[in-house]
């Protein structure tokens, strides 16, 4: 399992924290697949795009979505790592002036059209691990990551005080 | 100032053990990964373990799988490399590294001086 | 596994000279590379991230490119304290450092 412990000592002042650059300093396209290796794909309706989480057919091709990678400076205060202390940040966009949005009032994940710069529900702080498997915790509710629940992708907070199996906030990056 | 000092190397007997040390200072060492990382004399830079922040993932160089184990003490800002069943190929200075962003594994930002471990009869 | 091959293994340039080194990876690696520049008898030091970031305090003749599976670091003007021997290393896929390239005055 994943390990977060620890997470939410550090990142209370998430919100606080500057993007160190306007440009992203690198760029990532990838598709994005859960522990279990459930696609999440994204499909237009009504005019607007729902995310779903899904088994795809043998051989149906998997959807792509464009990770920005910026630098975030924790602030000074919080880190004690001065100018050391940077985050990674990333913005997840499956097509063109779409990105992913933390709704933390529903604990839901959206799709939003919006220009740039981005809010800052737009970004999550990039927790990784070996072999491409990542989290995305929420920049403006530490101790929030985007998972799965019932098919769908969702806000989960983790409790960084419990030894939870974390399983459904890991997340694999793929670019096939 | 980021400062990583290694120490507990030195010259040991073909299949007898050693522990090495990091201790860090200058940073939050509970938001970083940690990483060892050795070369051979002469020789160039080989990945031999990692831990992530909070200690729950390690990973290893196939070669020291089953011999090596990676271990952290946050309260201390302290990382360990026991070495069991050395062979004369692990001769070598180890260093050790930090990583670059908190979270992540990616990418090493500072290393230490390095201690020198020598596997000899 | 990812291999990374660097070349040539030794460089020898003239003061003041643009340099290029390479380094290639036996799979794609998305960017996911770093430049360290290793000094005789001293640790290794971070120069670049992420193929093109320079890391603080590193002077601005030295720069990265690349993509895919081949990645350059280039020295815009040699200076006398370039002299070293520098590896690439990727983090794509675990971590796997290229066997280096070391740096002469001519």
């Known amino acids: 399992a994943f390990g977060i412990s620890g997470v939410q000592k550090y990142t209370r002042a998430l919100h606080d924290s500057s993007i160190t650059g306007i440009s992203p300093i690198t760029e990532y396209l990838a598709s994005l697949s859960t522990y279990n290796d459930q696609s999440i794909t994204f499909a237009l309706e009504d005019e607007s795009y729902e995310i779903y989480v899904e088994d795809l057919k043998k051989d149906e091709k998997k959807d792509k979505v464009l990770l920005s990678y910026y630098e975030s400076q924790h602030p000074s205060n919080e880190s004690g790592d001065g100018v050391d202390g940077k985050m990674l940040m990333v913005t997840l966009s499956p097509t063109k002036d779409f990105w992913l949005h933390a709704n933390n009032k529903e604990h839901s994940v959206e799709l939003h059209k919006c220009e740039k710069p981005l809010p800052d529900q737009a970004f999550f702080v990039l927790h990784n691990m070996h072999s491409n498997c990542v989290s995305f915790e929420c920049k403006t509710d530490p101790g929030v990551f985007i998972g799965v629940k019932d098919n769908h992708l969702a806000l989960i907070k983790v409790d960084s005080s419990e030894n939870l199996c974390t399983e459904n906030i890991l997340f694999k990056l793929s670019e096939t | 100032e980021v400062q990583l000092v290694e120490t507990g190397g030195g010259l040991v007997q073909p299949g007898r053990s050693l522990k090495l040390s990091c201790v860090a200072s200058g940073f939050t060492f509970s938001n970083y990964w940690m990483y060892w990382i050795r070369q051979a004399p002469g020789m160039g830079l080989e990945w031999v373990s990692s831990?992530?922040?909070?200690?729950?993932?390690?990973y290893y160089l196939d070669s020291v799988k089953g011999r090596f184990t990676i271990s952290r003490n946050n309260a201390e800002n302290t990382v360990y490399l026991q070495m069991n069943s050395l062979r004369s190929e692990d001769t070598a200075t180890y260093y050790c590294?930090?990583?670059?962003?908190?979270?992540?594994?990616?990418?090493?930002?500072?290393w230490g001086q390095g201690t020198l471990v020598t596997v000899s009869s | 596994d990812i291999q990374m091959t660097q070349s040539p293994s030794v460089l020898s340039a003239s003061v003041g000279d643009r340099v290029t080194l390479s380094c290639k990876a036996s799979?794609?690696?998305?960017?996911?590379l770093d430049w360290c520049q290793q000094k005789v008898g001293e640790a290794p030091k971070l120069l670049i991230y992420?193929?093109?970031n320079l890391q603080t305090g590193i002077p601005s003749r030295f720069s990265g490119s690349g993509s895919g599976t081949d990645y350059t670091l280039t020295i815009s003007s040699l200076q006398p304290e370039d002299v070293a021997t520098y590896f690439c290393f990727q983090y794509n896929s675990g971590w796997t450092f290229g066997g280096g390239t070391k740096l002469e005055l001519k």
């Open positions: 831990i992530n922040n909070d200690g729950g993932n390690t």
């Open positions: 992420f193929t093109n």
């Open positions: 799979h794609n690696i998305n960017k996911h």
């Open positions: 590294a930090k990583g670059h962003y908190s979270y992540s594994s990616y990418s090493f930002s500072y």
